[in-house]
């Protein structure tokens, strides 16, 4: 069920996955929608408590029942992820937030004419996730016109505080407005030896890249294929970054692929959802549900229609004749990070991803017919 | 169900996945929508609490039931991800936020004429995710016209604070407005040895690239294929970045592929969703559901229709005759990051991704016909 309504002065009780800071409830829902498990959120609006350090907290929540009890809480804004909603989604947030200081790693500062230019700088910097701009009204004359480029490990501010004379906002990379070079190459037999900021298991390098693209700080990645000699690292997708924003060291190794985040790109292929079917591959993880369906397409649909489903494994029923309508077993699964915990082969399953995030790819994509 | 309404002064209780900071509830929902698991969010608006550090917090939430209990919370704005909504989505956010300082790593500062130019700089910088521009009204005269390019690990500000005289906003890369070079090549037998900011498992290098493209800080990636010698790294998608934004070292290794984020590109193919089916491939992860469907297409649709489903594996039923309607087993699964944790082959599964994010590709893409 798609619930677009937000509930003011209401907090969802329990189900906390994590807490981030966002400048608005709308952005909180955006974060929740893009979060692997977030189905509900509670956003602590400005003045929601006597403790300003709790303002702008965006509490991402999950529930096995996809609902949580609501409790009254002044200043809280609660709602549901848009995962269940049919409309086209966008990670592009052009809003700027006046008199809000979104805290993060201030890795760059420069004097620019206005907040738009500051946002443009952020959009055109690989590391920049959000920015704060000191306007001409900023109390400290010495800091006026200062554009601070920022990032955090999560892509959201560590905290958000009120600060007169500043404007904050997010990078517009997801708006397709970045002028940064779009590097679509995937490098086979390549390991990038930079900082691993995270690692996930992926069926292939393209999914790995989509994950990197969606990751707040991933700039490039290394993916270890099924043939990677170290069994424990097969299908491992290492999300990476570097201070320069580019890989520093490239190591040639068989059965590894590396590539770049597509976050700066104007996308002509999907980066948010992984529509492929992976044959003879099991995605393992938390079992959310097991249903009998006819075919991997129906199974994928079933997953797409399940707000908590991230991936599935379909085990066709054993056939002694070609009864194509016979149901196989469709395993609906989840994990903490939206990726299977392992990828196995040779078990007869057909694996793939929920298509719920496909609507998050841009309008251009959806009208392309398959070849 | 698609719930577009936001709930003011309401917080979703529990289900927290993470908390980020966003300048608006709209952007919070954007983040939630693009988050692999977020179905609901709570955004803490300005003045939502007495602690300004909690303002602009965007709490991403999930729930196995796709709902969470609502509690009253003054200043909170809660709502649902757009994952379940049918409309076209966009990650493009052209909004600028006046008097908001979005905190992050300030890695570049320069003097520009206005906020638009600052945003353009951000859009044309590989690392920049968002920016803050100090306007002519910024209190500190010396910092007026200063454009700060910013990034965070997550792509959202670490915190957001009120700051008079500044304007903040996001990079417009996802709006297709970046002038940065678009590098679409995927390099076989290539490992990029730069900083790993994250790693995911992907079925192929294209999914890996899409993930990198969607990742807030991924600029390039390395994907290790199924043939990668180190088994534990097979299908590993390493999301990478570097200070320069480009790979510093390229290592020739068989069975690895590398490439670049497409975030800067004007896309003619989808980058957000992964529509392919992966034969003889199992995606492993937390099991979300198992359903019997007819064919991988139905399975993928099932996944797509499941707001929480990210990818799937379809196991066709064993056939000895041509009964085409026979159902196979569709395992709907999810993980914390939307990618499989490992990918295995040889088990007869057909794997793929939910197509829910396909609608998130940009307007340009949908009007391009395939060759």
């Amino acid at each position: 069920e798609c619930v677009t309504k937000v509930f003011k002065d209401i907090s969802f009780q329990g189900g906390d996955l994590s807490t981030v800071f966002t400048p608005s409830a709308t952005y909180c829902r955006l974060v929740c929608t893009h979060h692997p498990r977030c189905l509900l959120f509670t956003f602590m609006a400005e003045s929601s408590s006597d403790d300003p350090t709790k303002w702008f907290a965006c509490i991402l929540k999950d529930s096995v029942t996809e609902i949580l009890p609501m409790v009254n809480m002044t200043g809280a804004i609660s709602g549901y992820s848009f995962k269940q909603c049919p409309q086209q989604l966008s990670t592009c947030s052009k809003d700027v937030y006046v008199n809000l200081d979104m805290k993060g790693m201030n890795y760059n500062s420069s004097v620019v004419k206005n907040a738009r230019e500051c946002q443009e700088r952020c959009t055109d910097d690989a590391h920049c996730q959000f920015f704060t701009y000191a306007t001409g009204y900023f109390p400290s004359v010495d800091h006026r016109k200062m554009c601070l480029l920022k990032y955090t490990r999560t892509g959201t501010p560590t905290t958000i505080t009120k600060l007169n004379g500043v404007v904050s906002g997010f990078s517009l990379k997801s708006c397709g407005l970045s002028n940064l070079a779009c590097i679509r190459d995937i490098f086979p037999n390549t390991v990038l030896a930079d900082l691993n900021i995270d690692s996930v298991v992926a069926p292939d390098a393209f999914v790995c890249r989509r994950i990197c693209t969606h990751h707040p700080t991933c700039l490039f990645f290394t993916f270890f294929s099924q043939a990677w000699p170290k069994e424990s690292q097969r299908h491992l997708c290492l999300l990476k970054t570097s201070e320069s924003g580019l890989p520093s060291t490239r190591i040639t190794k068989s059965h590894a692929l590396s590539g770049f985040s597509l976050q700066h790109c104007r996308h002509s292929v999907p980066v948010f959802c992984h529509p492929s079917f992976y044959n003879d591959t099991d995605f393992l993880g938390e079992e959310l549900d097991i249903v009998d369906v006819k075919g991997q397409e129906t199974c994928q649909k079933t997953c797409t229609n399940n707000a908590r489903c991230q991936f599935f494994t379909y085990y066709p029923s054993h056939r002694l004749c070609n009864e194509r309508n016979r149901r196989g077993r469709c395993y609906l699964k989840l994990s903490s990070n939206g990726s299977p915990t392992r990828i196995l082969h040779g078990r007869g399953g057909i694996s793939g991803y929920s298509l719920r995030l496909c609507k998050m790819d841009n309008v251009c994509t959806t009208k392309i017919n398959p070849r | 169900e698609c719930v577009t309404k936001v709930f003011k002064d309401i917080s979703f209780q529990g289900g927290d996945l993470s908390t980020v900071f966003t300048p608006s509830a709209t952007y919070c929902r954007l983040v939630c929508t693009h988050h692999p698991r977020c179905l609901l969010f709570t955004f803490m608006a300005e003045s939502s609490s007495d602690d300004p550090t909690k303002w602009f917090a965007c709490i991403l939430k999930d729930s196995v039931t796709e709902i969470l209990p609502m509690v009253n919370m003054t200043g909170a704005i809660s709502g649902y991800s757009f994952k379940q909504c049918p409309q076209q989505l966009s990650t493009c956010s052209k909004d600028v936020y006046v008097n908001l300082d979005m905190k992050g790593m300030n890695y570049n500062s320069s003097v520009v004429k206005n906020a638009r130019e600052c945003q353009e700089r951000c859009t044309d910088d590989a690392h920049c995710q968002f920016f803050t521009y100090a306007t002519g009204y910024f209190p500190s005269v010396d910092h007026r016209k200063m454009c700060l390019l910013k990034y965070t690990r997550t792509g959202t500000p670490t915190t957001i604070t009120k700051l008079n005289g500044v304007v903040s906003g996001f990079s417009l890369k996802s709006c297709g407005l970046s002038n940065l070079a678009c590098i679409r090549d995927i390099f076989p037998n290539t490992v990029l040895a730069d900083l790993n900011i994250d790693s995911v498992v992907a079925p192929d290098a294209f999914v890996c690239r899409r993930i990198c493209t969607h990742h807030p800080t991924c600029l390039f990636f390395t994907f290790f294929s199924q043939a990668w010698p180190k088994e534990s790294q097979r299908h590993l998608c390493l999301l990478k970045t570097s200070e320069s934004g480009l790979p510093s070292t390229r290592i020739t290794k068989s069975h690895a592929l590398s490439g670049f984020s497409l975030q800067h590109c004007r896309h003619s193919v989808p980058v957000f969703c992964h529509p392919s089916f992966y034969n003889d491939t199992d995606f492993l992860g937390e099991e979300l559901d198992i359903v019997d469907v007819k064919g991988q297409e139905t399975c993928q649709k099932t996944c797509t229709n499941n707001a929480r489903c990210q990818f799937f594996t379809y196991y066709p039923s064993h056939r000895l005759c041509n009964e085409r309607n026979r159902r196979g087993r569709c395992y709907l699964k999810l993980s914390s990051n939307g990618s499989p944790t490992r990918i295995l082959h040889g088990r007869g599964g057909i794997s793929g991704y939910s197509l829910r994010l396909c609608k998130m590709d940009n307007v340009c893409t949908t009007k391009i016909n395939p060759r």
Epitope: A181, G245, L246 | D124, N179, L180, A181, I183, R184
Partner: nanobody
Framework: QVQLQESGGGSVQAGGSLRLSCVAS????????VGWFRQAPGKEREGVAA????????YYADSVKGRFTISQDNAKNTVYLQMDSLKPEDTATYYC?????????????????WGQGTQVTVSS
């Protein structure tokens, strides 16, 4: 010390061809963006073509697409600009430039290292 040296300029009739070369010392084209830019008297410097050496991705200004070709020889640390079907409006000083970051490929403001330029004159 980084040095970029252009060569291959000269005078040619409209419709003719020239091949410009740019060799670098103290700077490697590998894994970096290299661009050709030009500036006519009284006009702003404009991007002509660029290449990213890692994969050979190329970028061209609309005015030269189909006529100019940029290429590289990593072993010689040299980048070339093959200019065919030259027009009088192609007359300018041509500069080779190297970047050290991911850049808008045809934006001269983002390139760090520059050569001295080589003159190209196309007469009608």
């Amino acid at each position: 010390q980084v040095q970029l040296q252009e060569s291959g300029g000269g005078s040619v009739q409209a419709g003719g061809s020239l091949r410009l070369s740019c060799v670098a010392s103290g700077y490697t084209f590998n894994n970096n963006f290299v661009g050709w830019f030009r500036q006519a008297p009284g006009k702003e410097r404009e991007g002509v073509a660029a290449i990213y050496s890692l994969g050979g991705s190329t970028y061209y200004a609309d005015s030269v697409k189909g006529r100019f070709t940029i290429s590289q020889d990593n072993a010689k640390n040299t980048v070339y600009l093959q200019m065919d079907s030259l027009k009088p409006e192609d007359t300018a000083t041509y500069y080779c430039a190297g970047a050290i970051t991911w850049v808008p490929p045809l934006s001269h403001r983002r390139y760090t290292y520059w050569g001295q330029g080589t003159q190209v004159t196309v007469s009608s």
